[in-house]
């Protein structure tokens, strides 16, 4: 008699998914020198040992600790871009901008990156039929705690002037609700962030709105003042403008408004 | 380039009041916050605080609380150093600098001297 | 309120020689691996300049003359070689914990 198992609303784990994250835990640690002494195997452990036999709607972040030290990681503090529903331009740009990083330019934000997982209480399988969805089931589920506890300790992380690339196409440019909005804003660490610089980055080629001055906007920056960070918006009208000057800063047509 | 530009040496007696300026040009003011340094005569480097530049929020080290006040009028990228009530201990030469935690633009400085 | 010690207080050095400043903590200053630890040259009558940040980095313009090491709690600056010009005070500062605290100064003379 089969085995009665939770029906979650959201998709279950992605399929292969545990040669997936040894599979980049192996490539990152190739491509990337400083961590080249990491064990991919006992990453994946402790990604396993995070959310394997646990209920996943009772998922905390010390269940993430072992992952989370095993995966410690320096990069530059002054030199990170966050970005919240613009993932795919905010990694075109990292990818360009070789010395600014996203989360998931890092090794455990790499491992993560686009994957669900999630297992059942008691038993050591891996759930690949359904997990919990976030608005419809519970929000300690695995996929939401990762990102929550990398997210917080990426903007702990940060100093100097953070950037965050905005998608001004959106109804919600700034959203309280994103994990930008209620994890990473909220732990800038005022005596190491100076500013928090925006970049609002448009949708239509016709669209001249000073995007800077959206109501969502004004928010943001109330939340950021309110933390004693000092904050800057910059419209970003032509993103493909954008990311062809950072490739080729010095092309003249570059010096004009982007 | 960025440049700081402090107002000009100031001899004042005890009890009076003074307000240094510092003039920032070559970068919009408001986007990086204005610390204050004092060194006085012969002496170390003491961070007195800073103000967001955005907001006009002060932050005051505990030693300079009261008679130190941080200001600005960011329609002629100035923030200001008053002190007032000046006390002998006073003297020193006053930077503004800038960015949060390490400072890599200076004003030249400006020399405050508290005699009778 | 983090305490820094910079020792020696003096010394004099040759030039072409090497010269190395410490600046002991009275508590790390280090924040998810970086150090916020920063070196500054100041000449009389000069505002203080800015020679390495976050205990490593070059500040642009500096010679490499100039190089910073050191986490948590202890931390180095080393000149070599020396030169003439280096004549200075060097002070080291964190800004990992508010206050912002600098060290006493080291007189750096050149023989």
């Known amino acids: 008699v089969p085995r009665w198992r939770q029906q979650w609303s959201g998709p279950g784990t992605t399929k292969r998914f545990p040669e997936t994250v040894l599979a980049r835990c192996v490539k990152y640690t190739e491509i990337h020198p400083e961590m080249r002494h990491v064990d991919c195997q006992s990453v994946w452990d402790a990604f396993k040992g995070a959310f394997i036999s646990k209920h996943p709607c009772n998922i905390t972040e010390e269940d993430y600790q072992p992952l989370m030290k095993l995966g410690t990681q320096t990069v530059p503090c002054n030199k990170i871009l966050l970005w919240s529903r613009i993932k795919d331009l905010a990694h075109q740009f990292t990818q360009v901008q070789r010395d600014m990083f996203t989360l998931e330019d890092t090794l455990l934000g790499y491992l993560a990156d686009d994957l669900t997982w999630c297992g059942e209480f008691n038993t050591s399988k891996i759930n690949y039929q359904s997990c919990p969805d976030w608005r419809k089931d519970c929000s300690n589920n695995p996929v939401s705690v990762f990102w929550k506890t990398v997210s917080r300790r990426f903007a702990e992380a940060a100093c100097d002037v953070v950037h965050v690339m905005l998608n001004g196409s959106r109804s919600k440019i700034f959203d309280k609700n994103s994990t930008f909005g209620s994890v990473e804003v909220h732990n800038l660490q005022p005596e190491k962030v100076q500013t928090l610089e925006a970049w609002v980055i448009h949708g239509g080629r016709e669209d001249s709105r000073d995007l800077c001055q959206d109501p969502t906007i004004k928010e943001l920056e109330s939340i950021i003042s309110k933390r004693n960070i000092q904050f800057s918006c910059k419209n970003i009208y032509r993103p493909d403008k954008f990311l062809q000057c950072v490739k080729n800063p010095e092309d003249s047509s570059c010096t004009s408004e982007i | 380039q960025v440049q700081l530009v402090q107002s000009g040496s100031e001899l004042k007696k005890p009890g009076a009041s003074v307000k240094v300026s510092c003039k920032a040009s070559?970068?919009?003011?408001?986007?990086?916050?204005m610390n204050w340094v004092r060194q006085a005569p012969g002496q170390g480097l003491e961070w007195m605080g800073w103000?967001?530049?955005?907001?006009?929020?002060?932050t005051y080290a505990d030693d300079f609380k009261g008679r130190f006040v941080f200001s600005l009028d960011t329609s002629v990228s100035t923030a200001y150093l008053q002190i007032s009530s000046l006390k002998a201990e006073d003297t020193a030469v006053y930077y503004c600098?800038?960015?949060?935690?390490?400072?890599?633009?200076w004003g030249q400085g400006t020399l405050v001297t508290v005699s009778s | 309120d983090i305490v820094l010690t910079q020792s020696p207080a003096s010394l004099a050095v040759s030039p072409g020689q090497r010269a190395t400043i410490t600046c002991r903590t009275s508590?790390?200053?280090?924040?998810?691996?970086?150090?916020?630890m920063h070196w500054y040259q100041q000449k009389p009558g000069q505002p203080p300049k800015l020679l390495i940040y976050?205990?490593?980095n070059l500040e642009s313009g500096v010679p490499a003359r100039f190089s910073g090491s050191g986490s948590g709690t202890d931390f180095t600056l080393t000149i070599n070689p020396v030169e003439a010009n280096d004549t200075a005070n060097y002070y080291c500062?964190?800004?990992?914990?508010?206050?912002?605290?600098f060290g006493q100064g080291t007189k750096v003379e050149i023989k």
């Open positions: 103000i967001n530049t955005y907001t006009g929020e002060p």
């Open positions: 976050r205990a490593s």
């Open positions: 508590e790390s200053v280090d924040s998810y691996g970086n150090s916020f």
């Open positions: 600098a800038r960015y949060p935690g390490w400072f890599a633009y």
């Open positions: 500062q964190q800004s990992n914990e508010d206050p912002w605290t």
């Open positions: 070559g970068y919009n003011l408001t986007n990086y916050g």
